[in-house]
Every structure is written in C-alpha cells, then in structure tokens.
C-alpha cells in the first residue's frame, strides 16, 4: 500500500522532537551546573 502518514502521525513526531530538545537542554544545564560545582570544590 502507498498510504501516506496523516497529520496526527506527524504531530506526535513533532511533540517527540520538542521533548527530545527539552531533554537535551536539561542535560546540558545539568552538565553546566556540575562543572560549576566542580570548579567551586576545586577552589
């Protein structure tokens, strides 16, 4: 069958992308906080 995806399929995909971006941002912030903490402890 040559059936295309519907918008619902593609909207869920968009939501997943947004959540993945948010997760990546959260991890980056966590890493930054950890680095800052290590700098403080290191001093």
């Amino acid at each position: 069958s040559e059936e295309p995806p519907i918008s619902l399929d593609l909207t869920f995909h968009l939501l997943r992308e947004v959540l993945e971006m948010a997760r990546a941002e959260q991890l980056a912030q966590q890493a930054h906080s950890n680095r800052k903490l290590m700098e403080i402890i290191g001093k």
């Epitope: 069958s1 040559e2 059936e3 295309p4 995806p5 519907i6 918008s7 619902l8 399929d9 593609l10 909207t11 995909h13 968009l14 992308e17």
Partner: antibody
Framework: EVKLEESGGGLVQPGGSIKLSCVAS????????MAWVRQSPEKGLEWVAE??????????FYAESVKGRFIISRDDSKSSVYLQMNSLRAEDTGTYYC?????WGTGTTVTVSS | QIVLTQSPAIMSASPGERVTISCSAS?????MYWYLQKPGSSPKPWIY???NLASGVPARFSGSGSGTSYSLTISSMEAEDVATYYC?????????FGGGTKLEIK
C-alpha cells in the same frame, strides 16, 4: 494547530506558466507526503501530484493529464511545497488545494484564459 | 487506476433519518477517506483511514468497510449535514476520488 496555506494563483494565458506555493505549520513537515488536488465544475476533484518525504527520496508522482507539464517540489527548511505549472491549458482552470490525507488548505484559484 | 463509484449520486433524507453513502472500488484498497464539501467552501477531511472521525466531526457520523466496499453513515440526519460527500483512496497511484454524493434534506 495544523495548517496548510496556498498562494500564487491567478489569471494566466494558455501556454503560460505559474507557480503555486503552500506553507505548512503545526506538524513535522519533513515527514509528510504532500499532494496537490484540484477542483473544477467540469471535472470535480482531481489528484494532480504528490511528493514523498526524504525517507522515500522525495519521489514524485503525477496525474497523466499533467505529466511533463507540472513539477512538484518541496523545501523542508521552509516547510513548503510547490507546484510549477507550465504549458497551461484551459482545462487546468480550477481551485488548487495543498493536502495531507486529513488536512486541506483553503485553496488558490488558477484561471487559464486569453 | 482504481475507480471509485459512489452511490447514490444524489439523495434526500428527513431529519432524524439514518443515512448511508456507499463507495465501491474497482479493486481492493486498504482504507477509505471521506470529505465533506458545502457550497462555496473547500472540501473538509471528514473520515480518515476508513473509520476515524476528523477533529470536530459529530459522533453521529461513522465509517466502515474493507476491500472494495466502504460506507459513510449518519445515524440521525441533521440540517447541517447537507453537503456533498466524496470518497478517496490512498492505496495506490494515481490517487482517485469518487464522483460525490449530494445529500439534501426533505
């Protein structure tokens, strides 16, 4: 909100060219297979062309009546799909809709007349 | 190409009446899609993948079928249901539409 918005229609002489555009929003455009459908009082609803997504190598398909005259293309970075219409005939007159199976735009009208 | 034949072409129903519109395919398809069009407006997706109602479609509408035989049913006709209904197949290229069923109210 999922939305498709067409533009570019107008009056064109037989043998002339025109390019239609459609901007999408509210979904992951790069994953979509986009199609153009037209409607006229004479022929009713008629599928014109379709372009698959990148995963399917942006494969294109055309109705026999437009093959060799129309070109469908897309720009995923702009969430847009286009229909380049060449060698236009009177029978190409109609309202052109940008579509997904479950979403249609409001259409743009093309009139081919001298 | 797959030819879709809708029946009836025109029909009239009384308020509260059950309405069934049929769409017959010349060869087997995996799903059917339905669109509603009111005069002066663009077609609206109404039922997708045979039986799923598009957003905002009243629950009195339903879709069913398989193979070469599909239908759209209105359990209880209302004045706002007056429109032309089209079926479409996405099973293969070229995509094709039925000729439409114009639904009127008595």
């Amino acid at each position: 909100e999922v939305k498709l918005e067409e533009s570019g229609g107008g009056l064109v002489q037989p043998g002339g060219s025109i390019k239609l555009s459609c901007v999408a929003s509210g979904f992951t455009f790069s994953g979509a297979w986009m199609a153009w459908v037209r409607q006229s009082p004479e022929k009713g609803l008629e599928w014109v062309a379709e372009i698959k997504n990148k995963a399917n190598n942006h494969a294109t398909f055309y109705a026999e009546s437009v093959k060799g005259r129309f070109i469908i293309s897309r720009d995923d970075s702009k969430s847009s799909v286009y229909l380049q219409m060449n060698s236009l005939r009177a029978e190409d007159t109609g309202t052109y809709y940008c579509t997904l199976p479950d979403v249609w735009g409001t259409g743009t009208t093309v009139t081919v007349s001298s | 190409q797959i030819v879709l034949t809708q029946s009836p072409a025109i029909m009239s129903a009384s308020p509260g009446e059950r309405v069934t519109i049929s769409c017959s395919a010349s060869s087997s398809v995996s799903n059917m899609y339905w669109y509603l069009q009111k005069p002066g407006s663009s077609p609206k997706p109404w039922i997708y993948r045979t039986s799923n109602l598009a957003s905002g479609v009243p629950a009195r509408f339903s879709g069913s079928g398989s193979g070469t035989s599909y239908s759209l049913t209105i359990s209880s006709m209302e004045a706002e249901d007056v429109a032309t209904y089209y079926c479409q197949q996405y099973h293969s290229f070229p995509r094709t539409f039925g000729g439409g069923t114009k639904l009127e109210i008595k």
